[in-house]
Interface confidence: low
């Protein structure tokens, strides 16, 4: 239905604390190098003017678009050319070119500071002094380093923050109470943030088919009592809400998010049995819980799905008068059946019996070509299940540090032209796969490992994009979306590579890596070990082992030693020659 | 599957002792950090003390500094609380978790200190 005035009607919906603080999250996304009062004038600014529109519709420029409000608002920035160079340029387009041009300069990896959590008396009087500027700064800090962040869940973080501080705060010991609450909000944002992600790459760059294909099969598994009709209601809903908040559409994409909350509480009969203590829940919670709640239970006796997709005479002719209807209903059957595979397998299946369908109805005997369909799915099946179970062993046998480490040889020896940090900051979230998945029964573990996986190789593609260095991480991410994993599983060493010329600066520490958290000292040993690699890529997991072993007892000795610094110039230099040697540097 | 199994509390006078055990299993035990913590009657839960997978970094709750100590046998995939100097205002269901949550996923043990 159409509205007069779009900013009045969306103010009007959200109500002015939403609407301000999405205002916000939006602006930060795009200029993500502005000061936070710049983005607060500016926010007040376009909330004045959305209180006149609301007053009288009809009032000037109240009928605008909101791209073109918000873009016009974003172009009063003086010092846009100086900060953002060419993304200046974006303001001398029209709608829409002009939203999709910023939508472009999005960066993924903004050069900025990283967070430095103050003491928690600090953060507890500047949330006493100012509460409001105070969750305004993190929605703002969090908005402009991840810039694809799903804004309504952003709003349910900063719920939580504001909970924490005003627990902790006047509890008796503050740090006790706060760390692990912001630590573990830390932890789940950077999760949070990786996934929408995802969603936002394969809107983007595989299209609205390839995400209502992973929204099918992801909603079939967690909701397979409900209807065919039903889901693909809920697909095209979620679409529509994952497109506006990828597109920057924040204010539409919340209210919408709000809706099909609502819709879905409405109809939880139909639905699912597990939706319940969702629903009881305020606007906010109810939708994170929605898209984190557990798969409801299959329906008993579900026919064998052979019946209507392989047997039946009808095939061709079903798949000849709606293709995407009918691969749809059969990715539904099969996810419902099967919320022990992963969404990426699914994906695969169902692309398996398309190719077969497509060939077959062709063919002169379309039954007797299609009828092994599913025989061709069982290896399909046990690649990832294999992979998963040797895997989880590894993980099993050494620890989350050193199975790490494993992948970052193993990643650095496939890709080693990708930029040291990128291969650290991959491996790490990589390696995380073991401690979050494997404790799973085996019913549970692909669909936690593959689809965590899918997130992790996602974020080495959009930061590999901005600075294109290796043509098999090109080809692994544009490919196929769903054979990403295992195309990258494939990469051997790379044996075109040349090695890294060895430059001992690299391998020279200093006592400050003593007073590091143990998570920091780790960074800094893979970062080593990703440099030993390029220096050396056939190097073999024994020295590679005895060369991390003297550097961990290297650094050890320094730091217990009454001069620390005149130790790790010392010893630094033993170690650096003695490495050499180890590996025939 | 994950389970976590607390045991050895129990009814003790005021400046007594006791120690907790949690055995747990279905996960990496020595892969993750562990907490414990503690419900009063009517009251939301407390976190208590936490340690790390290694067992060499651990925290406490002002409330009970000095007094308690948490520690791990990750060969016996057991964490324990030995808790001392206990007063009645220690008296709780204690729970231990994965982590530094204070979502409780086990039955754990009532500890009850009264004269």
């Known amino acids: 239905d159409a509205h007069k005035s779009e900013v009045a009607h969306r103010f009007k919906d959200l109500g002015e604390e939403n609407f301000k603080a999405l205002v916000l999250i939006a602006f930060a996304q795009y200029l993500q190098q502005c000061p936070f009062e710049d983005h607060v004038k500016l926010v007040n600014e376009v909330t004045e003017f959305a209180k006149t529109c609301v007053a009288d519709e009809s009032a000037e420029n109240c009928d605008k678009s909101l791209h073109t409000l918000f873009g016009d608002k974003l172009c009063t920035v003086a010092t846009l050319r100086e900060t953002y160079g060419e993304m200046a340029d974006c303001c001398a387009k029209q709608e829409p070119e002009r939203n999709e041009c910023f939508l472009q300069h999005k960066d993924d990896n903004p050069n900025l500071p990283r967070l430095v959590r103050p003491e928690v008396d600090v953060m507890c009087t500047a949330f006493h002094d100012n509460e409001e500027t105070f969750l305004k700064k993190y929605l703002y800090e969090i908005a402009r380093r991840h810039p694809y962040f799903y804004a309504p869940e952003l709003l349910f973080f900063a719920k939580r923050y504001k909970a924490a501080f005003t627990e902790c705060c006047q509890a008796a010991d503050k740090a006790a109470c706060l760390l692990p609450k912001l630590d573990e909000l830390r932890d789940e944002g950077k999760a949070s943030s990786a996934k929408q992600r995802l969603k936002c790459a394969s809107l983007q760059k595989f299209g609205e088919r390839a995400f209502k294909a992973w929204a099918v099969a992801r909603l079939s598994q967690r909701f397979p009592k409900a209807e065919f009709a039903e889901v693909s209601k809920l697909v095209t809903d979620l679409t529509k809400v994952h497109t506006e908040c990828c597109h920057g559409d924040l204010l539409e994409c919340a209210d919408d998010r709000a809706d099909l909350a609502k819709y879905i509480c409405e109809n939880q009969d139909s639905i699912s049995s597990k939706l319940k203590e969702c629903c009881e829940k305020p606007l906010l919670e109810k939708s994170h819980c929605i898209a984190e709640v557990e798969n409801d239970e299959m329906p008993a006796d579900l026919p064998s799905l052979a019946a209507d997709f392989v047997e039946s005479k009808d095939v061709c002719k079903n798949y000849a008068e709606a293709k995407d209807v009918f691969l749809g209903m059969f990715l539904y059957e099969y996810a419902r059946r099967h919320p022990d595979y992963s969404v990426v397998l699914l994906l695969r299946l169902a692309k398996t019996y398309e190719t077969t369908l497509e060939k077959c109805c062709a063919a002169a005997d379309p039954h007797e070509c299609y009828a092994k369909v599913f025989d061709e799915f069982k290896p399909l099946v046990e690649e990832p299940q294999n992979l998963i179970k040797q895997n989880c062993e590894l993980f099993e046998q050494l620890g989350e540090y050193k199975f790490q480490n494993a992948l970052l040889v193993r990643y650095t020896k496939k890709v080693p032209q990708v930029s040291t940090p990128t291969l650290v900051e991959v491996s790490r979230n990589l390696g995380k796969v073991g401690s979050k998945c494997c404790k799973h029964p085996e019913a549970k573990r692909m669909p936690c490992a593959e689809d965590y996986l899918s997130v992790v190789l996602n974020q080495l593609c959009v930061l590999h994009e901005k600075t294109p260095v290796s043509d098999r991480v090109t080809k692994c991410c544009t490919e196929s979306l769903v054979n990403r994993r295992p195309c990258f599983s494939a990469l051997e060493v790379d044996e075109t590579y040349v090695p890294k010329e060895f430059n001992a600066e690299t391998f020279t520490f200093h006592a400050d890596i003593c007073t590091l958290s143990e998570k920091e000292r780790q960074i800094k040993k893979q970062t080593a070990l990703v440099e030993l690699v390029k220096h050396k890529p056939k190097a073999t997991k024994e020295q590679l082992k005895a060369v991390m072993d003297d550097f961990a007892a290297f650094v050890e000795k320094c730091c217990k030693a009454d001069d620390k610094e005149t130790c790790f110039a010392e010893e630094g230099k033993k170690l650096v020659a003695a490495s050499q040697a180890a590996l025939g540097l | 599957e994950v389970q976590l199994v607390e045991s050895g509390g129990g009814l003790v006078q005021p400046g007594g002792s006791l120690r907790l055990s949690c055995a747990a299993s279905g996960f990496t035990f020595g892969s993750f950090g562990m907490s414990w913590v503690r419900q009063a009657p009517g009251k939301g839960p407390e976190w208590v003390s936490a340690i790390d997978s290694g067992g060499t970094d651990t925290r406490y709750a002002e409330s009970i500094k000095g007094r308690f100590t948490i520690s791990r046998d990750n060969a016996k995939k057991t964490l324990y609380l030995q808790m001392n100097s206990l007063k009645p205002e220690d008296t709780a269901v204690y729970y231990c978790?994965?982590?530094?949550?204070?979502?409780?996923g086990s039955q754990g043990t009532q500890v009850t200190v009264s004269s």
């Open positions: 978790t994965i982590g530094q949550s204070t979502s409780r």
